[in-house]
């Protein structure tokens, strides 16, 4: 829990947060997500790095893999085969993009306590996973997929056409990884391991982004990534399914694309196995307002996959793009044909619907002026989901159970009253058949993870309560946080304000706006954090505000889709509107207002600084987008359409930071970017800098050599130290 205000007599023992606290991660918290292996058992890595199996029902635990074994191969991760005979140990982790990495894998045989010798796995492997039953292995090596019946067997090579930067089998290319699948893998086992589905991405015709990686050598090397920017040629995707018992019988069979999708450029968006012989694929038109869910069945006689038109379900948006950030995925019920899915209702709120035959006949399961966010699990009699319904705070998350076995279905909030002050933002992790579940509370108080009975919802035990963190915070003067809303011209702007510990409404404080503001994002959340802005409030006496304006999520389609085809307009307007309202509150020094953001937030902060309002004295943009023509097709076109004359080229041109170069003349601007940013290319900041120089506008800049979009490691310390100096100088705060 957040320490309450202490009496003055104790106040001298309290200290403010320091920048060092933040950079050292002194006040970071832990969460506990059980690695479920059955209805009542889970694995967990203990503090001393043993892999321990816990049985909830017997209360017993035992070590299945010792830290000694882990250490013998420098393992940083593990995976138990479903038949519990083998464990893979992962070492030599080497990060690639956001989700992807390569690693070396060793297989440990639990029956004899030895590593499997003979037919060892090649290295490095791009992805590896066990089948859901038994101990088959699928893995991706050099962009090709391999299968092993058992770990000691020789592999069966499923694909042969894999080529670096050209053909990707079983793993996504850059754009699918970052903007569509949000995973490092693109292969999926059927529930009993009979079939393996996989995607093949052909990037042959995609333009390549090339940037220098300076390293330590005499000559820098060039990184080349097939990266489709807005309007460019996209990857060509195909989905195949192979019988893993008889993989050479007919080989991989391609799953047909629905005709209405295949008629023009399209994306594959996700694959969900229903049974061993039924699979559900989701497709999306390149113009991302039409999505098709296609249910396909295995034809034993032809050894092919049949996707009848009667099993195609269309989801179309007339006011924006399909879905939220991504199109939602279905959760199938036990009849293996009907499913539950979140999509917009007639009032424009995302809710759970039950689809039995057609989308038109869908039965709405939840409703109201709030949104269902995630379906966690569907059992025979219950559906567990999260929403922000409780007390009408969009930045909260509670877990609900709907009984689907009875009529009418009854709804119960599982989390709303558990630790009401401490916990308002939950996620959950369920065991098989939802026999048990873990709740992970992220705040606003100190995070806590608990274990619960899936039938009674009774708390069984605390898994992690962050006691050390609670004790460490006892003598820290934390800032106060409040979450409130502004009503402006029929728009609700929720904001979070972080106030100095001794905040006094009669005084004037410098204000820093922290902005992200990207479509379908949410910054105003009831979560715990001790971070850089906590320090700025605690030690430097700043007020920090985060505002969710138009384009942000979980408050209905009207707010979400307001930015459709017009990025860079309303997001900026709403930040400015909020600042004006904050000034009216009387405690903001209007001569000391700054704005900062990263990525999309860097774009918004740059546009806000260049808005010509005179509101902002200074601001920072970290790794900003500067023109939507420079960013990835899948993301950009979802919200902006195509940069063509007959589509939306005009707004692409109007919404650049460069077009506003003149307006930076009256603000202090700090522009920051990593030179090896694979995501928002350094090109974006290079073009801003060029435009500012051409306009003879002074500005400050910092680049981070060989750093990507995350600016990690030592760069993080340098970055926050540098930004702190900049802000203190801007606000005339002494060092």
């Amino acid at each position: 829990l957040r320490p309450s205000r202490v009496h003055n007599s104790e106040e001298n023992t309290m200290r403010a947060l320091t920048l060092k606290d933040i950079l050292n991660g002194t006040f970071s918290y832990k969460t506990f997500f059980p690695n479920w292996i059955s209805g009542q058992e889970y694995l967990h890595q203990s503090a001393d790095n043993n892999i321990v199996l816990y049985n909830i029902e017997t209360g017993q635990s035992y070590t299945i893999l010792s830290n000694r074994t882990m250490k013998s191969v420098n393992a940083s991760n593990y995976g138990l085969s479903p038949d519990r005979q083998f464990v893979y140990l992962e070492s030599d982790y080497s990060k690639l993009w956001r989700y992807s990495y390569t690693a070396t894998y060793y297989i440990y045989d639990l029956s004899n306590g030895e590593f499997v010798r003979g037919n060892e796995l090649p290295r490095p492997i791009q992805y590896l996973c066990w089948s859901p039953v038994g101990s088959k292995l699928a893995y991706v090596y050099q962009n090709n997929i391999y299968l092993k019946q058992r770990p000691g067997d020789p592999p069966f090579q499923i694909t042969f056409n894999g080529r670096e930067n050209k053909i990707f089998n079983g793993i996504p290319d850059w754009v699918y990884e970052e903007e569509m699948l949000a995973t490092k893998y693109a292969l999926w086992w059927s529930p009993n391991g009979k079939f393996l589905a996989y995607a093949e991405f052909n990037d042959t015709d995609i333009p390549v982004i090339a940037y220098s990686y300076y390293g330590d050598e005499q000559y820098p090397r060039t990184i080349n990534i097939p990266y489709p920017k807005a309007g460019a040629k996209n990857p060509v995707v195909r989905i195949f399914i192979i019988d893993t018992t008889y993989p050479a019988y007919v080989g991989p069979q391609e799953v047909p694309v629905p005709a209405m999708i295949a008629s023009s450029d399209y994306y594959f968006s996700w694959l969900t196995w229903v049974t061993d012989e039924r699979v559900c694929l989701q497709w999306l038109k390149r113009v991302q307002n039409v999505s098709v869910l296609s249910i396909c069945d295995f034809r034993e006689d032809w050894q092919t996959w049949d996707c009848p038109k009667t099993q195609e379900h269309i989801e179309e948006s007339r006011t924006g793009w399909a879905g939220g950030f991504f199109v939602s995925t279905p959760v199938f019920s036990y009849d293996a044909i009907s499913y539950y899915k979140i999509f917009s209702d007639k009032d424009g709120y995302k809710h759970i619907h039950y689809i039995k035959d057609t989308v038109e006949n869908a039965i709405q399961i939840t409703s109201g002026k709030w949104e269902a966010i995630n379906i966690f699990r569907v059992t025979q009699d219950s559906l567990f989901y999260s929403s922000n319904e409780f007390e009408e705070y969009p930045g909260r998350r509670n877990i609900y159970r709907i009984s689907i076995g009875s009529y009418p279905p009854s709804k119960k909030c599982v989390t709303c009253h558990l630790r009401k002050e401490r916990c308002q933002y939950y996620t959950a992790s369920f065991s098989d058949y939802a026999k048990y579940y873990a709740l992970v509370c992220y705040g606003p108080g100190i995070p806590i993870s608990t274990l619960h009975d899936g039938r009674t919802d009774q708390e069984i035990k605390i898994l992690e309560e962050n006691k050390e963190l609670e004790n460490a915070l006892k003598n820290i003067q934390l800032p106060k946080e409040e979450i409130k809303k502004l009503e402006v011209d029929e728009i609700t702007l929720w904001y979070k304000m972080i106030l100095p510990p001794q905040f006094d409404r009669s005084k004037k404080y410098p204000l820093l706006i922290q902005v992200y503001g990207g479509p379908c994002s949410q910054s105003v959340r009831s979560v715990f954090a001790v971070n850089w802005i906590s320090y700025l409030a605690s030690k430097e006496g700043m007020v920090i505000a985060l505002v969710d304006g138009r384009g942000t999520a979980f408050q209905g389609d009207k707010l979400l889709y307001a930015v459709y085809r017009k990025l860079g307009v309303y997001e900026v307007e709403d930040q400015i509107t909020a600042v004006r309202k904050f000034i009216e509150m009387g405690f903001i020094d209007e001569k000391r207002i700054a704005i900062w953001g990263w990525s999309y937030g860097g774009y918004v902060s740059s546009l806000a600084l260049a808005s010509g309002t005179g509101l902002f004295k200074c601001g920072i943009a970290v790794a900003p987008v500067s023109s939507w023509e420079y960013y990835a097709s899948v993301y950009t076109e979802r919200f902006m359409g195509l940069p063509t004359k007959d589509d939306n080229l005009e707004h692409y041109k109007n919404s650049t930071v460069m077009a506003r170069a003149e307006y930076f003349r009256n603000v202090d601007y700090l522009l920051i970017h990593g030179t090896a940013d694979d995501n928002v290319h350094f090109q974006n900041s290079a073009q801003i800098a060029k435009a500012l120089v051409n306009a003879q506008v002074d500005f400050q800049a910092m680049w981070y050599s060989d750093q990507n979009h995350g600016l990690s490691g030592l760069s993080t310390n340098h970055l926050y130290t540098h930004m702190t100096h900049f802000l203190k100088q801007c606000f005339s705060l002494s060092d």
Partner: antibody, heavy 118, light 107 residues
């Protein structure tokens, strides 16, 4: 280590029947396709039959179709070949082999000789 | 059924020789081609699977190549224990067929 041991071979008259067995050990028998391959004296190898891991799916060479039946008992880790209506040309050493991925024979038994003669 | 034709049917070679055996399929079998060694009175032994992959425990002097219809088994330096009969085998459509064999004899 993987071991396959055939038994049940012998001398049988044309038209007669014989049941071969293959006892498997050293691997998870229930997870693999198993097969019979034969070799007539002084001749090459000829595939006879295979059976899927679960036992429901089978395949036969045209030369034995309708006369031979392959089966397995996963609880006993044993593969069988029921041979009916035997002919002189069925005389061969019969090998039990694991048919990995339905593609290659990675482990073989030592073989059992079946002689069909009057 | 797919027919497999091996050549030569027999060959004489000396220890240290490089030996090449070819196998041709009557239609394309991708890379689903395997090679076996059989010594008199013994069961066959897998040498090469999937056209070019060396089975665990097999000496590296054995190698395989090819795809589609034409395949080769090469013994880079023939050893005394390599005198045996060699068979190629395919298994498309779950109908395995063997070549007629190549007998490698001492010259």
């Amino acid at each position: 280590e993987v071991q396959l041991v055939e038994s049940g071979g012998g001398l049988v008259q044309p038209g007669g029947s014989l049941r071969l067995s293959c006892a498997a050990s050293g691997f998870t028998f229930r997870g693999y396709i198993m097969s019979w391959v034969r070799q007539a004296p002084g001749k090459g190898l000829e595939w006879v039959s295979w059976i899927g891991p679960e036992g429901s799916r089978t395949g036969y060479a045209d030369s034995v179709k309708g006369r031979f039946t392959i089966s397995r008992d996963n609880s006993k880790n044993t593969l069988y070949l029921q041979m009916n209506s035997l002919r002189a040309e069925d005389t061969a050493v019969y090998y039990c082999a694991r048919l990995l991925y339905g593609t290659w024979f990675d482990y073989w038994g030592q073989g059992t000789l079946v002689t069909v003669s009057s | 059924d797919i027919q497999m034709t091996q050549s030569p049917s027999s060959l004489s070679a000396s220890v240290g020789d490089r030996v090449t055996i070819t196998c041709r399929a009557s239609q394309s079998i991708s890379s689903y081609l395997n090679w076996y060694q059989q010594k008199p009175g013994k069961a066959p032994k897998l040498l090469i699977y999937a056209a070019s992959s060396l089975q665990s425990g097999v000496p590296s002097r054995f190698s395989g190549s090819g795809s589609g219809t034409d395949f080769t088994l090469t013994i880079s330096s023939l050893q005394p224990e390599d005198f045996a009969t060699y068979y190629c085998q395919q298994a498309t459509l779950l109908l395995p067929t063997f070549g007629q064999g190549t007998k490698v004899e001492i010259k």
